[in-house]
Interface confidence: low
Amino acid sequence: FKVATPYSLYVCPEGQNVTLTCRLLGPVDKGHDVTFYKTWYRSSRGEVQTCSERRPIRNLTFQDLHLHHGGHQAANTSHDLAQRHGLESASDHHGNFSITMRNLTLLDSGLYCCLVVEIRHHHSEHRVHGAMELQVQTGKDAPSNCVVYPSSSQDSENITAA
């Protein structure tokens, strides 16, 4: 499977909410011995590999934000810790995987990475990630609502796999 990032850039005004989205593409095994982990973190555009560095989102680490579920299940964080920080990550039955950030501030600007790991028990893992930029703006040049910029076909297959 692959991870697509439908939008590579989100430009939002301060105070707005935004939902960053990744999507699983391709065949997804739904067997009983397969489990998915999905999470979000901030990163920087490294010279070698984007998303290799894992920084917290609003002081929450990728551990705090991770979801785990079998192939047939949907999942969301819903726990108090994330919600207290104005965050919620969620996943549906259709391969969509998102994090919602409420009441954006300028400090939220940066590179965000989604990571999906397929674990096959007794076998090796398969890891893929996607990256997108969030720009939070203030002042007269800021949009009134979030503006999203679709990924190019190349960017939307913005993946690394192992």
Epitope: H121, T160, A162
Partner: antibody
Framework: QVQLVQSGAEVKKPGSSVKVSCKAS????????ISWVRQAPGQGLEWMGG????????NYAQKFQGRVTITADESTSTAYMELSSLRSEDTAVYYC?????????????WGQGTLVTVSS | DIQMTQSPSSLSASVGDRVTITCRAS??????LNWYQQKPGKAPKLLIY???SLQSGVPSRFSGSGSGTDFTLTISSLQPEDFATYYC?????????FGQGTKVEIK
């Protein structure tokens, strides 16, 4: 702060088994892989296998397959490693180590180590 | 299995020296490469993850680089507490494998 506390040193006879425990505190237990890594005297580090407690299924290095059993008890936040058919070359310090996120095998927290001596 | 080969196996250096340790993987592991420090009688300590990311609480004199098959751990200015054995480890595929270690000794 996450802490991994292992059981005490063991002296065993060749052919017997040993079971080492690793009790976790200070963090979520179920969602993080616990691995066992051993180190023979004066030697390097060797990964034996690992388990993510919430899944309940362990993965083992081929070298130890059939001789090692890794289990986890979520109710007590304790992982166990049992090694059977012991031989003298199994004399080593056995460490439990926690992965820094659920499915990864980069180890950010380690137990203090348990010395297992196999001697007749 | 992926074989990890470190060089040198040991080195002697003085406080303040710049020290470089290399690690080579038998096949490409992208940046799934971690570095540990171990002192006698103690458990290893994670220094660098994902080839170049500094683990929280680790001094900035430690840095890592590389991708694919060739990786480097650099200590920019060796301190007395840095004399130890250093291990690389790949977590690209199971089984997880470590390098044989590099012992950094006082000259």
């Amino acid at each position: 702060q996450v802490q991994l506390v292992q059981s005490g040193a063991e002296v065993k006879k060749p052919g017997s088994s040993v079971k080492v425990s690793c009790k976790a505190s200070g963090g979520t237990f179920s969602s993080y892989a616990i691995s066992w890594v051993r180190q023979a005297p004066g030697q390097g580090l060797e990964w034996m296998g690992g388990i993510i407690p919430i899944f309940g299924t362990a993965n083992y290095a081929q070298k130890f397959q059939g001789r090692v059993t890794i289990t986890a008890d979520e109710s007590t936040s304790t992982a166990y490693m049992e090694l059977s058919s012991l031989r003298s070359e199994d004399t080593a310090v056995y460490y439990c180590a926690r992965s820094s996120y659920g499915w990864s095998y980069e180890f950010d927290y380690w137990g203090q180590g348990t010395l297992v001596t196999v001697s007749s | 299995d992926i074989q990890m080969t470190q060089s040198p196996s040991s080195l002697s250096a003085s406080v303040g020296d710049r020290v470089t340790i290399t690690c080579r993987a038998s096949q490409s592991i992208a940046t799934y490469l971690n570095w540990y420090q171990q002192k006698p009688g103690k458990a290893p300590k994670l220094l660098i993850y994902a080839a170049s990311s500094l683990q929280s609480g680790v001094p900035s004199r430690f840095s890592g680089s590389g991708s694919g098959t060739d990786f480097t751990l650099t200590i920019s200015s060796l301190q007395p507490e840095d004399f130890a054995t250093y291990y690389c480890q790949q977590n690209h595929n199971r089984p997880i494998t470590f390098g044989q270690g590099t012992k950094v000794e006082i000259k």
